[in-house]
């Protein structure tokens, strides 16, 4: 082993890390788990502990980036340099960066979680055998409904385990259609579409209508990404394989190496290669994020490269399923930090959490999905895609309170609740509220008295939201909720009436989640809420950090603003934007300075 000159190391043992962003190659839970397991390798043999935090002052900040990504050490495209890490120290020192031009996997091909089927949401196994043939991507073979599926073991013929792959024919994400699948063909701007399209959007996201006519119904969703069949290189990088495709007059239902001398798998990205000549390489085995992270974290802890070829800290990537740490790695890290205090524990047995699956359909090799069993989309706020802009708020007749320093919104440390109402941001605190419209040099207006505008409300609010379609305003305080429609109020009602149990002490926030649906938050938990029925779906209860990794677990307010989700803790917010299947923290800032544009004096 080698350490860098001066034995650079951390001088405290409780190391913190922040996962700043994510790769789209793997489900977030798998990425979180890969990093946690990588840290666990080092904590198992030293006195070090690793705690995940959600702020940039973490010791080790983990980031995915491509090419020039904000430091002086750009990445180099696919392969070559996979990642890099800085030695221990303040600021960027100790951070670990991963090249997102790589295909990140667990070392054995793309990770595609499944839905339905009979495999409890297990990931696809590539390659797999079906009817004696090998498949390296999801397939529609054996089915008449066009739904792509995969085996979750190496051999479907012998094991019969399968699930359905992400497909717009099964579900869509975000949008305003509550996760309904695409309707093909559909009409958009008078034109017929029989596949997902990026037309009408500037951000490159693929979408579809969920009814036969978008122009009339304005219902849409985003098409799920298909990591298993998104091609690299060739002349169609980023596009999807089309199966079956014709090559030299023959039909192919899976990637092939035919016509190549190097054995690399490829596919056509249209149904006919012979006429269209559009193609790309199929995904390879990818690099194990767990193994690469374990190596980089070794650097971030102060280890240089080892000259022992079997060591984790040897400078060449080598996939292994055995224990990654070699005696040389252990000696190196213990040279810096000493051994783990006795008694020596058994090696931790960490397993990758499997995504939870919806109810399974009894299979008779692989069956069609009944419409009633189609899943709903993940409840995330829409990307910049709402087909209609938010309505503007009506003029307010509220009276302004005489001003004192504490009445300046910029002097408020922590607001009780924040909500976007109409196209303005409302900020509530101790019986008062301010209104804010984004714009150059604009300042919050107010304070106004809550009692003047909404006389039934208490002084202290926990959260507020406006349901855009009905213009209903929901105000939560403690175990009670008030619903205002214009000047008329319903309530107070107890949270039980919304289907929230006695263990829910307060509602701390809400986000839109499709047409007439919201997510309600309380501490670390969230539920889907039907605004019309004014009931939560009790089966929808979920952990906040599963759906929104990277946000603090003790947020006191969650609100939506300009189509992004904001999670507030203390004076700070964590902003989350939804991109394809990922909810990604893209900014951490101060409510006052960064949202309200208060001067930093």
């Amino acid at each position: 082993f080698q350490t860098f000159e001066g034995d650079l190391k951390w001088h405290h043992h409780n190391i913190t890390y922040w996962i700043q962003n994510y790769s789209e190659d793997l489900p977030r839970a798998v990425i979180d788990d890969a990093f946690a397991r990588a840290f666990a390798l080092w904590s198992a043999v030293t006195p070090l502990t690793f705690t995940r935090v959600y702020s940039r002052d973490a010791d080790i900040v983990i980031q995915f980036g491509v090419a020039e990504h904000g430091d002086g050490y750009p990445f180099d495209g696919k392969d070559g340099l996979l990642a890099h890490a800085f030695p221990p120290g303040p600021g960027i020192q100790g951070d670990a960066h991963f090249d997102d031009d790589e295909l990140w996997s667990l070392g054995k091909g793309v990770v595609v979680p499944t839905r339905f089927g009979n495999a409890d949401g297990a990931a696809c196994h590539f390659p797999f055998i079906f009817e004696g043939r090998s498949y390296s991507a999801c397939t529609t073979d054996g089915r008449s409904d066009g739904l792509p599926w995969c085996s979750t073991t190496a051999n479907y013929d012998t094991d019969d385990r399968f699930g359905f792959c992400p497909s717009e024919r099964l579900y869509t994400q975000d949008g305003n259609a509550d996760g309904k699948p695409c309707q093909f063909p559909f009409i958009f701007q008078g034109q017929s579409y029989s596949a997902c399209t990026t037309d009408g959007r500037s951000d490159g996201y693929r979408w579809c209508a969920t009814t036969a006519n978008y122009d009339r119904d304005k219902l849409f969703g985003f098409c799920p990404t298909r990591a298993d069949s998104t091609v690299m290189g060739g002349n169609s990088a980023g596009e999807l394989c089309v199966f079956p495709f014709t090559f030299l007059g023959k039909e192919y239902s899976t990637c092939t190496s035919e016509g190549r001398g190097d054995g690399r798998l490829w596919c056509a990205t249209t149904s006919n290669f012979d006429s269209d000549k559009k193609w790309g390489f199929c995904p390879d085995q990818g690099y194990s994020l767990f193994l690469v992270a374990a190596h980089e974290f070794g650097h971030a802890l102060g280890l240089d490269h080892s000259s022992v070829p079997e060591a984790l800290m040897y400078p060449m990537y080598r996939f292994t399923e055995g224990p990654p740490l070699h005696k040389d790695d252990v000696n190196g890290i213990r040279h810096l930090y000493g051994p783990r205090p006795e008694p020596e524990p058994r090696p931790p047995t960490t397993t990758t959490p499997q995504p939870t699956a919806p109810p399974t359909v009894c299979p008779t090799g692989p069956p069609t999905v009944h419409p009633s069993e189609r899943p709903t989309a993940g409840p995330t706020g829409p990307p910049s895609a709402g087909p209609t802009g938010p309505p503007t708020a009506g003029p307010s007749t509220a009276t302004t309170v005489p001003l004192s320093p504490v009445d300046d919104a910029c002097n408020v440390n922590i607001f009780d609740a924040i909500a976007e109402i109409g196209n303005q941001l409302y900020l509530f605190k101790d019986g008062k509220y301010w209104r804010f419209s984004e714009g150059r040099g604009s300042r919050p207006q107010g304070p106004f008295l809550i009692a003047d505008k909404w006389p039934a409300l208490p002084r202290k609010l926990d959260s507020v939201f406006e349901e855009r379609l009905s213009k209903k305003l929901f105000f939560f305080s403690g175990r009670q909720v008030w619903v205002y429609t214009g000047a008329s109020v319903l309530g107070p009602r107890r949270l039980d009436k919304l289907g929230l149990g006695a263990d829910v002490a307060q509602v701390t926030g809400a986000l839109r989640s499709g047409r007439g649906k919201m997510l309600l938050f309380s501490g670390r938990r969230l539920w889907r809420f039907d605004v019309k029925a004014q009931m939560v779906d009790p089966r929808s209860a979920s952990e906040v950090d599963r759906m929104f990794p990277g946000v603090p677990l003790d947020t006191h307010d969650v609100f939506q603003y300009r189509e992004k989700a904001y999670f507030c803790q203390d004076r700070f917010y964590w902003r989350v934007s939804s991109r394809s299947e990922l909810n990604q923290v893209d900014q951490v800032g101060y409510v006052t300075y960064d949202i309200l544009q208060c001067p930093e004096d």
Epitope: F4, Y73, P74, G80, H84, P87, G91, E296
Partner: antibody
């Protein structure tokens, strides 16, 4: 002892080509990022191009599309192929070894430099 | 690109005096700064890396300090062989850039 020895400089007409070489010895050449830095007569230092041990290449905007950096790890040699040369490319060209290598970064500085080779572009 | 500004452009001092050379970055570069010495007809020589670490074989009279945007190279007591041009170079962001140089001459 670490040594870097450049060669291949000379007088060339505008639009012409030259290939510079840098022979390295005394360290594990294949491990390190390598650089070409130039210095026009009487002027300061300017980064031209660099190459990772993995082969990833980077270029200053002023030479992009005209210069190509490469390395032959079996021969411990760094190259700079210069095409479409212009008068403003006239300079002493130095090859330099980085202190940082591979994926362990955060070490800034070029700890060894060659003696330089003069490239003159003139008609 | 990050601009590196060195000052003064020329510094005239006598042997035995203390020399203080300044380098300012147009934005924060953490501690990713190196100092080089170049004598006429020679290649640059690394003096200081990562803002404050002396390179191998560099005398103790050379020291570097600073972090963020402001950096200083100090020569505690000038020797005759120290008269040269000094360059700073950053790698806090891509691409790397050099300062325009400070000429240290005998007074």
């Amino acid at each position: 002892e670490v040594q870097l020895l450049e060669s291949g400089g000379g007088l060339v007409q505008p639009g012409g080509s030259l290939r510079l070489s840098c022979a390295a010895s005394g360290f594990t050449f294949s491990t390190y990022q390598m650089w070409w830095v130039r210095q026009a007569p009487g002027k300061g230092l300017e980064w031209v191009s660099s190459i990772y041990s993995s082969g990833g290449t980077f270029y200053a905007d002023s030479v992009k599309g005209r210069f190509t950096i490469s390395r032959d790890n079996s021969k411990n040699t760094l190259y700079l192929q210069m095409n479409s040369l212009r008068a403003e490319d006239t300079a002493v060209y130095y090859c330099a070894k980085d202190r940082a290598y591979g994926d362990y970064v955060g070490w800034n500085g070029f700890d060894y430099w060659g003696q330089g080779t003069l490239v003159t572009v003139s008609s | 690109d990050i601009q590196m500004t060195q000052s003064p452009a020329t510094l005239s001092l006598s042997p035995g005096e203390r020399a203080t050379l300044s380098c300012r970055a147009s934005q924060s570069i953490s501690s990713f700064l190196a100092w080089y010495q170049q004598k006429p007809g020679q290649a640059p020589r690394l003096l200081i890396y990562d803002a404050s670490y002396r390179a191998t074989g560099i005398p103790a009279r050379f020291s570097g300090s600073g972090s963020g945007t402001d950096f200083t190279l100090t020569i505690s007591s000038l020797e005759p062989e120290d008269y040269a041009v000094y360059y700073c170079q950053q790698r806090g962001n891509w691409p790397i850039t050099f300062g325009q140089g400070t000429r240290l001459e005998i007074k």
